[in-house]
């Protein structure tokens, strides 16, 4: 049995229904069987877990996803073995295997792989700060969202009116969410906002930086 699946990965927003397309061509016999299984990201195919079987004319959803899986066509004997997965969770991200068996059609292995990414908006990020906050010192502002798929990019902005910082005194890394401030001055004090963004939305946090004279302690 030759199985056909999309070549490009599938992306589905959190809470929506994913349709994992799988089709095949074979003269369906009574021994026809379909199995859908799931592998977590980074794990080998050998560690797949079954989520649905069809055999002997009956459908058997199984495992932790069993209440959320069904077939687009039941029975899946018309050449369409497409899986529907409702209310997708972040833990549904991974590789799905569509395997069709139909003895004596052994021309190919009857296996198709589909990568699913569940799209999750960034969670409210956590803003933190470390380093010397006295005049002339350096500090790092960090921003991180615990959730978000694809991984959010981070952008720091300083709120309010302020003099333009000298070039090189503000360097940010959109991937790590870190903003490094060097050669601090009293005018570096103020509120800084980090915005975490992906295709599903954005979320932000704020942090107030107080730069002090060298003799004073730091206040965050």
């Amino acid at each position: 049995v030759e199985v056909k699946v999309p070549t490009e990965p599938l992306s589905t927003p959190l809470g929506k229904t994913a349709e994992l397309t799988c089709t095949y061509s074979t003269s369906v016999g009574d021994s026809f069987a379909l199995e859908w299984s799931f592998v977590q990201p980074g794990k080998p195919i050998s560690e797949s877990h079954p989520i649905l079987y069809f055999t002997n004319g009956h459908l058997y959803p199984t495992g932790s996803k069993s209440k959320r899986v069904s077939l687009l066509q039941n029975p899946p004997t018309v050449g369409v073995a497409t899986l529907k997965l409702t209310d997708v969770h972040p833990s549904d991200t991974g590789t799905y295997l569509c395997q069709v068996n139909n003895p004596p059609d052994f021309y190919t292995n009857g296996l198709g792989l589909i990568n699913l990414t569940v799209l999750v908006p960034p969670s409210n990020p956590l803003c933190s700060q470390s380093g010397q906050t006295s005049v002339g010192g350096s500090t790092a502002l960090r921003c991180s969202s615990s959730e978000g798929a694809p991984k959010p990019v981070y952008n720091w902005v300083r709120l309010g009116t302020f003099p333009t910082p000298s070039p090189g005194s503000m360097v940010q890394d959109e991937v790590s969410g870190q903003l490094i401030l060097t050669n601090l001055s009293l005018t570096s004090s103020g509120t800084y906002r980090c915005v975490a963004t992906n295709q599903m939305g954005s979320a932000s946090c704020e942090l107030t930086l107080s730069v002090t004279e060298p003799s004073q302690g730091r206040v965050a």
Epitope: S25, S27, P75, G79, D105
Partner: antibody
């Protein structure tokens, strides 16, 4: 030598019923998917039903669904098509055909003519 | 449903001619296509399956090609026995459908 011989065709009034038969020989019938394909006079071919090797799975196009029933008796090497609620547009030569491992038709019978007319 | 469209509907040719018949599918059917030959008053005969595979006994002057939505049946040198009607059929997802046929007649 593979042989498929259809029978049971004839003249029937609209709304009537007819049962076609196909006798198979020369191959292992119980291992083969089978289909019926029809051809209206002077027209092209239309697949009308299929059945899996043991009869568990049957399929039909929308044009005949709910009116036609395909069945088989592997002990008798026979394929059947029960046609109910016949319409004028069902008038055609009905061929019994064996399916390959993929669903193309590698052997065909000689056909039996069904005429639906008042 | 997948629609199959053949062209031309009729083709006039002479013995020895190279003849090409085209079949288009309304959506991607990969290589799941069969060709049949039918002579008047006879049942169809399988010529090609999986777009390009010839069953045993089919003369090598017949060849099939194509994938996706565009397919061709070629007769490299038309013989007297080849004057007939030719049909394409997809063997992908049900319902399996046929083209309307191409009649190859003597010029």
């Amino acid at each position: 030598e593979v042989q498929l011989v259809e029978s049971g065709g004839g003249l029937v009034k609209p709304g009537g019923s007819l049962r076609l038969s196909c006798a198979a020989s020369g191959f292992t019938f119980s291992n083969s998917g089978m289909s019926w394909v029809r051809q209206a006079p002077g027209k092209g071919l239309e697949w009308v039903s299929s059945i899996s090797d043991g009869g568990l799975y049957t399929h039909y196009p929308d044009s005949v669904k709910g009116r036609f029933t395909i069945s088989r008796d592997n002990a008798k090497n026979s394929l059947y098509l029960q046609m109910n609620s016949l319409r004028a547009e069902d008038t055609a030569v009905y061929y019994c055909a064996r399916q390959g491992v993929r669903p193309f038709f590698d052997y065909w019978g000689q056909g039996t003519l069904v005429t639906v007319s008042s | 449903d997948i629609q199959m469209t053949q062209s031309p509907s009729t083709l006039s040719a002479s013995v020895g001619d190279r003849v090409t018949i085209t079949c288009r599918a309304s959506e991607n059917i990969y290589s799941y296509l069969a060709w049949y030959q039918q002579k008047p008053g006879k049942s169809p005969k399988l010529l090609v399956f999986n777009a390009e595979t010839l069953p045993e006994g089919v003369p090598s002057r017949f060849s099939g090609s194509g994938s996706g939505t565009e397919f061709t049946l070629t007769i490299s040198s038309l013989q007297p026995d080849d004057f007939a009607t030719y049909y394409c059929q997809h063997h992908y997802v049900i319902p399996w459908t046929f083209g309307q046929g191409t009649k190859v007649e003597i010029k």
